[in-house]
Every structure is written in structure tokens, then in C-alpha cells.
């Protein structure tokens, strides 16, 4: 079982945590990817695109792992049925790293001096190749982890957080839904700039396609900023009305999203959402809850805040 999972990961499905005996895997390419999909919880949803099956409480792993971050803009995914279209102003901007902030004094050009178009094209290609190499390295690390091998030296491991710390980070975080596919983390941060100090921004991407999923998480430095940010619920961001709600910390064994794929065993569960959230779950790309078939969850585990 473990070897099969590792082999599948090597073939391109490099997600999933752990590969111990008895680990169930559903090697189904990631469904979904529509804007606003996914419940706002799951501290595990923060991981940028790494997915695994829904975990039982006894299966939970205590060490988060580094996650791949696709850096180049993928081809624009077509909006799925029922999902809002890209909307006005959603053309993909240039890389946000190229834009200088107003009021800055430009310094040494370094390698950035504008030269002839041919040279610029070569530089762009080199950058693309660099990105591909980075992604391959991250993919390799994931495969090695699944095979219980240590990653190559020099790649520092993540800081291990306690469950309490992760839940506390969740309490300072918000879920942002219906995010335009062309949006960058910088643009999102700017939109929430007035709400307080931001610790991190993560736009989630599909592990298989690399396409943005249409939702994001923002972690603030304090809980007060979360309350302030809720005023931006239904505000316009890149021509789309975004959904802003507090990030929910998942409980053990409860899936954060329902993919609709039957599992090996059937388990009936009910999930109670408080009334303040029912508007979101009933009307925003949600699927019926509490049915017998449980779909494959995208959350890596219930407590991982990223």
C-alpha cells in the first residue's frame, strides 16, 4: 500500500501525508477547482494545494510538512458551471514583483536593466526553467517524505507548532471566497491592508493542475483584525464580490469539503453549522451535507493551520 502510494505520488500526485500501512488512498485527480469551493475551515486547507484523504483521529500526524507553491501563473482555468465568470478587471496582471511601490526611490538596476527583446526573452525562459526546477525539487521532497526518506540536506524543516498554536492561528485567520483566478497574494493583502497587520496570505492552488482554486486564507497578527476584516464581506475585489468569514478550526474526523467521491466505507455524519454561517453554506457553491457518501477531503488534517 505504501509503495503504491509513493509510486502514484511520483507519477504526479505528490500530495498526501504519511504512507504507513493501512493508509487508504483514493488516486482520483483533484475534482473541484471552482471559485469559492471548500469550506472555510480546516486548518489544513491552508496548505497550498497538497491534498490527502480524510483522516481518522488516530491517523493524524503531528508534523506539518513544507508544501509546494506554484509560482508561475498557470493557464487561466475555465469557470465551472455555476461559478461566477472572471468578471471585469480580471485580466492577469504582470508579476507583482515587477511593480515598484509609489514613493520609492529606484536604486541599482543590477540585472534588471532593460536590454534588447531577445535577451529579455532568454531571461524570461531562464526564470521559467528556474520555477520548474523549484517545483520538481519540491515534488521530489514530497515523494521522499512519503517513502520515509529524509529530504536532501540544506532544506530546513518546518517549525513544528502545537495543536493549540495552530488553533490560535486559526482564530486570527479569515477565509476569502470567490477570489478572481488572476489575483495575486499582494493584491489580496492590499485589499485587507486597513484591517490590521497581516502575518501571511495563501491563495490555494489545485495540486494537480496548479490552477488557483478561487479562495484564500489570510492570517492576521491579532483577533481584532478578523472582526474588522468581516466588514469587507461582499466587497468588490477585482470586479468580483468576495466572501469573507472567520476561518473555522475543524474537529477531528470531520471533512472540510465534500467532493462527492464514494469512500471505501460508508459513514454517515452530520455537521452542525451555526446560523450565522448558514447563509454562506447554503448559497455559495456548497453541496449537501450529512449524506452517507463522504467525499475525499482536501484538508491534510484537522489541525494543521497551513
Amino acid at each position: 500500500m505504501a509503495a503504491a502510494a509513493a509510486a502514484a505520488a511520483a507519477a504526479g500526485a505528490a500530495g498526501g501525508r504519511g504512507s504507513g500501512p493501512g493508509r487508504r488512498r483514493h488516486l482520483v485527480p483533484g475534482a473541484g477547482g471552482e471559485a469559492g469551493e471548500g469550506a472555510p475551515g480546516g486548518a489544513g486547507d491552508y496548505g497550498n494545494g497538497l491534498e490527502s484523504e480524510e483522516l481518522e483521529p488516530e491517523e493524524l500526524l503531528l508534523e506539518p510538512e513544507p508544501e509546494p507553491e506554484p509560482e508561475e501563473e498557470p493557464p487561466r482555468p475555465r469557470a465551472p458551471p455555476g461559478a461566477p465568470g472572471p468578471g471585469p478587471g480580471s485580466g492577469a496582471p504582470g508579476s507583482q514583483e515587477e511593480e515598484e511601490e509609489p514613493g520609492l526611490v529606484e536604486g541599482d538596476p543590477g540585472d534588471g536593466a532593460i536590454e534588447d527583446p531577445e535577451l529579455e526573452a532568454i531571461k524570461a525562459r531562464v526564470r521559467e526553467m528556474e520555477e520548474e526546477a523549484e517545483k520538481l525539487k519540491e515534488l521530489q521532497n514530497e515523494v521522499e517524505k512519503q517513502m520515509n526518506m529524509s529530504p536532501p540536506p540544506g532544506n530546513a524543516g518546518p517549525v513544528i507548532m502545537s495543536i493549540e498554536e495552530k488553533m490560535e492561528a486559526d482564530a486570527r485567520s479569515i477565509y476569502v471566497g470567490n477570489v478572481d483566478y488572476g489575483a495575486t497574494a499582494e493584491e489580496l493583502e492590499a485589499h485587507f491592508h486597513g484591517c490590521g497587520s497581516v502575518n501571511r496570505v495563501t491563495i490555494l492552488c489545485d495540486k494537480f493542475s496548479g490552477h488557483p482554486k478561487g479562495f484564500a486564507y489570510i492570517e492576521f497578527s491579532d483577533k481584532e483584525s478578523v472582526r474588522t476584516s468581516l466588514a469587507l464581506d461582499e466587497s468588490l475585489f477585482r470586479g468580483r464580490q468576495i466572501k469573507v468569514i472567520p476561518k473555522r478550526t475543524n474537529r477531528p474526523g470531520i471533512s472540510t469539503t465534500d467532493r462527492g467521491f464514494p469512500r471505501a466505507r460508508y459513514r454517515a455524519r452530520t455537521t452542525n453549522y451555526n446560523s450565522s454561517r448558514s447563509r454562506f453554506y447554503s448559497g455559495f457553491n456548497s453541496r449537501p451535507r450529512g449524506r452517507v457518501y463522504r467525499g475525499r477531503a482536501r484538508a491534510t488534517s484537522w489541525y494543521s493551520p497551513y
Epitope: 508561475e72 508579476s95 536604486g107 534588471g112 519540491e138 497574494a185 488557483p212
Partner: nanobody, 115 residues
Framework: AVQLVESGGGLVQAGGSLRLSCAAS????????MGWYRQAPGNQRELVAT???????SYAGSVKGRFTYSRDNAKNTVDLQMNSLKPEDTAVYYC?????????WGQGTLVTVSS
């Protein structure tokens, strides 16, 4: 995920120098932008210095000529050499990692400049 750890802050007299360092670990992408920001008490974070993916370094007008930004991609570190420090440079200095899909901030290091 990416972790950022700043170091080098401390108390210094006006006119003195300090060198701040930020070490990044985790899923680092070499094309990401890494910059230094600062936040004085009661103020919002402001950009101090940054380098774009094309190698262009930008500085806030108030630090131009006094602060120097450097980046070592091999070691995944960014440094900020601060010379001719002034009392108004007193702030918590933060390192920021910014890529297409992700932004991470460090915890900050306090720099106090006494007159």
C-alpha cells in the same frame, strides 16, 4: 510553508550602524520578492527596501543612501545594512517573503536608536 527569522536588532546610538539579517527556510522559490519593512509605535508598516525578481532594488526615500539591501539566494538570506542611524529609525523591522500565491511575514526585530 516558509519560515522567516529576523536577527540583528538592538539598541544603538544615533549615527551608529546595525546589520539586520533575515533567514528563510521551507519551500523557498528563488523568484520570490523579499523585502524589509518597519513599523514604528502607532504607525503602519512601511517599506524600507526590497528587490524585485528582476534584480531592481528599491528604497524608501528616508533611508536612501544610508541603508543597503543585499540578498544571498544560495543561503536564502536577506540583509539590511543600516548606517548613520537616526532616532526616527526606531521601529520593529520585519522581513517579508512575497510570491505569486503566498506572502509570509517574520516576527520582527526591534531597533532602538537613542539620541
Amino acid at each position: 510553508a516558509v519560515q522567516l527569522v529576523e536577527s540583528g536588532g538592538g539598541l544603538v546610538q544615533a549615527g551608529g550602524s546595525l546589520r539586520l539579517s533575515c533567514a528563510a527556510s521551507g519551500s523557498i522559490v528563488s523568484l520570490a520578492t523579499m523585502g524589509w519593512y518597519r513599523q514604528a509605535p502607532g504607525n503602519q508598516r512601511e517599506l524600507v527596501a526590497t528587490m524585485s525578481s528582476s534584480g531592481i532594488t528599491s528604497y524608501a526615500g528616508s533611508v536612501k543612501g544610508r541603508f543597503t539591501y543585499s540578498r544571498d539566494n544560495a543561503k536564502n538570506t536577506v540583509d539590511l545594512q543600516m548606517n548613520s542611524l537616526k532616532p526616527e529609525d526606531t521601529a520593529v523591522y520585519y522581513c517579508k517573503y512575497s510570491s505569486r500565491w503566498n506572502i509570509y511575514w517574520g516576527q520582527g526585530t526591534l531597533v532602538t536608536v537613542s539620541s
